[in-house]
């Protein structure tokens, strides 16, 4: 039994982690600077998307890049419980805190702000430079989706790395996982064409959920051959005249649930991966 | 002046490097196994490409993946001159060999076979599983293109890493370079739409040349809406009916030079990067 409550321990761990973050700002500032620069570069490359076939390609391309970038950037989250492993074991044995206090304290002070920031920065820079769908809900859905991708990818990193002593193996494993997840995200292969004995793998792909949600959010209601007389039979000359046609070809459900089910899936993954990470820390404590 | 000729030294360095490679086969065998597994996985995912709009997406996707995979796999080439840096300086000072003998010896025995193998394996597995263009010339052009991409990416790795003492910085720099090169390769963004003040960057992108060559080789002459009822008005429903239409939309020159200029560019990059790597080794020797 502990003399201090869970909440007190949680506050204490969070405070210390946050102080460490502010006391060593180089890493955080560097991450922000890199995110801003990358956001501006992406914004410049894709500046002012057209509403034609190149507009379809460029929209899909930038959304894919943002999704996969969020995943690969999250590989750095493997360090969260690895670098402080010895300190955690020492302090836990000494009765400083519960495993749960340490776990949630680190998440709240470190993971939450450091994974939220890139999503906000990317969305704010890229959205307006590219001229994505000009509605407030679409803007915030994109921001929320990128956050969810970052959190689920980071959670997976924690689940793989928690309790390990070296970062390199976890990093390699994460990278391999994300490469396969990237293939199944829906840009490099049309998911409707994959053989049934393999297609189930798409449901384990974090970027697939993020990319699908971002596409649903951006393409729905878009017109990619504007100016054509819609009454004339020949409007059929364009393979993909509407965002709906494009989404249907990609096998994406057009209903609102077709959007939100991706966030539900990512939320489930976050819960599952964080549970695994927590159990690994508990398991670690038993063998310490 | 040296008592032994350049050729004798070259043979000696090559022989030793090759013996090291065979004496420690785990790395080589592991690379071959990983390549075979990845080839089979890619073959299974994209098995039997269709001749419709999904066929266009899947062809472009797999060719993009193979190109970028060749690039990122070549990052490991940074080790070639780094891990033996001290040994090289010691042996060079002791008058064992010329810099040129060591340089070309290492290239011939280590870089040449280890970068050629994945290209051959990938092509042999993927080509027939996917059902790419069934002509011998197209098969060998794909193999040659993947080799050229691997060699130019590896040459870039050598140019960055030669003379350095630690692998990590060079690896990070290579990865960042390849991420930007990947954006400019032509799948994630339609290169015809990039602003002129930025579009020149595409000419420094290794995967862009590889991806363009692979697409030219595969798409030319392909029919992506075959067998449509020729009298029905809706036959025009397909935006991209031929490989030529697709290539033109991507800004790819349809002439034979449109294919071979990519290999010429890659060859020029190989020469430039290897020259830089060689000069860095020469420069290193002066300061040893």
């Amino acid at each position: 039994s502990y003399t201090t409550s869970f909440c007190h321990q949680l506050r204490w761990v969070s405070k210390r982690s946050f102080k460490n973050l502010l006391g060593n700002p180089q890493a955080s500032i560097a991450q922000i600077i890199v995110t801003v620069i990358l956001g501006l570069v992406i914004g410049a490359i894709y500046f002012g998307l057209n509403n034609d076939s190149t507009g379809i390609q460029n929209r899909a391309g930038v959304l894919f890049f943002l999704t996969t970038n969020q995943c690969f950037s999250s590989v750095s989250a493997v360090e969260l419980f690895v670098v402080e492993k010895k300190l955690f074991i020492h302090e836990y044995i000494s009765g400083y805190y519960r495993v749960s206090s340490y776990f949630f304290g680190k998440l709240l002070s470190d993971l939450l702000p450091m994974r939220m920031l890139p999503s906000i920065i990317f969305t704010c820079i890229v959205y307006f430079m590219l001229g994505l769908k000009p509605t407030a809900d679409a803007f915030f859905i994109m921001m929320f989706t990128l956050m969810m991708v970052a959190y689920s990818a980071s959670s997976m990193a924690l689940a793989i790395a928690a309790g390990q002593s070296v970062v390199s193996v976890a990093t390699l494993l994460m990278t391999i996982c994300f490469v396969f997840m990237m293939i199944f995200s829906g840009l490099l292969v049309n998911l409707t064409t994959i053989a049934s004995w393999l297609s189930w793998l798409q449901y384990f792909s974090i970027p697939r959920y993020g990319f699908t949600a971002l596409q649903h959010n951006e393409f729905l209601g878009q017109n990619f051959c504007p100016g054509l007389n819609a009454t004339v039979n020949n409007t059929c000359n364009y393979a993909t005249c509407t965002g709906e046609e494009y989404l249907t070809k990609q096998g994406i459900d057009l209903s609102p649930w077709g959007l939100w089910k991706n966030h539900v899936a990512l939320a489930c993954m976050i819960v599952i991966f964080l549970t695994i990470a927590y159990l690994k820390l508990l398991f670690l404590k038993k063998y310490s | 002046s040296y008592t032994t000729s350049f050729c004798h030294q070259l043979r000696w360095v090559s022989k030793r490097s090759f013996k090291n490679l065979l004496g420690n086969p785990q790395a080589s065998i592991a690379q071959i196994i990983v390549t075979v597994i990845l080839g089979l996985v890619i073959g299974a995912i994209y098995f039997g490409l269709n001749n419709d709009s999904t066929g266009i997406q899947n062809r472009a996707g797999v060719l993009f993946f193979l190109t970028t995979n060749q690039c990122f796999s070549s990052v490991s080439a940074v080790e070639l001159f780094v891990v033996e840096k001290k040994l090289f300086i010691h042996e060079y000072i002791s008058g064992y060999y010329r810099v040129s003998s060591y340089f070309f010896g290492k290239l011939l025995s280590d870089l040449l076979p280890m970068r050629m193998l994945p290209s051959i394996i990938f092509t042999c597995i993927v080509y027939f599983m996917l059902g790419l263009k069934p002509t011998a010339d197209a098969f060998f052009i794909m193999m040659f293109t993947l080799m050229m991409v691997a060699y130019s990416a590896s040459s870039m790795a050598l140019a960055i890493a030669a003379g350095q003492s630690v692998v990590s910085v060079a690896t990070l720099l290579m990865t960042i370079c390849f991420v930007f090169m990947m954006i400019f390769s032509g799948l994630l963004v339609n290169l015809t739409t990039i602003a002129s003040w930025l579009s020149w960057l595409q000419y420094f992108s290794i995967p862009r040349y590889g991806f363009t060559a692979l697409q030219h080789n595969e798409f030319l002459g392909q029919n992506f809406c075959p067998g449509l009822n020729a009298t029905v008005n809706n036959t025009c429903n397909y935006a991209t009916c031929t490989g030529e239409e697709y290539l033109t939309k991507q800004g790819i020159d349809l002439s034979p030079w449109g294919l071979w200029k990519n290999h010429v560019a890659l060859a020029c990059m190989i020469v430039i990067f290897l020259t830089i790597a060689y000069l860095k080794l020469l420069f290193l020797k002066k300061y040893s």
């Epitope: 004339v232 039979n233 000359n237 | 001749n51 075959p226 025009c236 397909y238």
Partner: antibody, heavy 118, light 106 residues
Amino acid sequence: EVQLVESGPGLVKPSQSLSLTCSVTGYTITSGYDWTWIRKFPGNKMEWMGYISYSGFTNYNPSLRSRISITRDTSKNQFFLQLNSVTTEDTATYYCTRTRGYNPFAYWGQGTLVTVSS
Amino acid sequence: DVVMTQSPSLLSASVGDRVTLSCKAGRNINNYLAWYQQKLGKAPKLLIYNTNSLQTGIPSRFSGSGSGTDFTLTISSLQPEDVATYFCQQYNSWTTFGSGTKLEIK
């Protein structure tokens, strides 16, 4: 009903340019499809030459790419074939047709015989 | 280019006969094959596409079959108006035509 009619000189001198016109009625060439030229040589061999699509995109047979040009006049609903540096080997009956891409040709003109001779 | 070889180059048959014309492709063309009929001084007329799909307005006595590289056009009961030259066309990779089979009545 779509109708295609070829017109142009029946005799062309070697090294000169062959120019043919295809007039389309019953369908607007900018509305859809690819408007194609095909030729049939005296020995019955048939060759696809190239097309101009509804969007203005042109696609040519690689063996002819250096000397062929297909253009259109949308106001007159016509498309044209120009073949440069002709030889006696270019003697054939030239047809204009409508399809999409390389697909089967359901609509043909009646054909026009062009002889290349000095 | 995919070379298309038609045989025979000349075929004589009697009215009412079942006639088969052959077309061989230089490589697999995924059943993307069409047949045309061309009468003297006329434009070719599309009979069959996708190996076995009958074009609208074409009599049902014409049928197509085959797969891979070997294809046939069959006229179940030859009629006098079927005298013509028949061409095959592949449209799998670019488009190429056979050299034709001239069909005449004995």
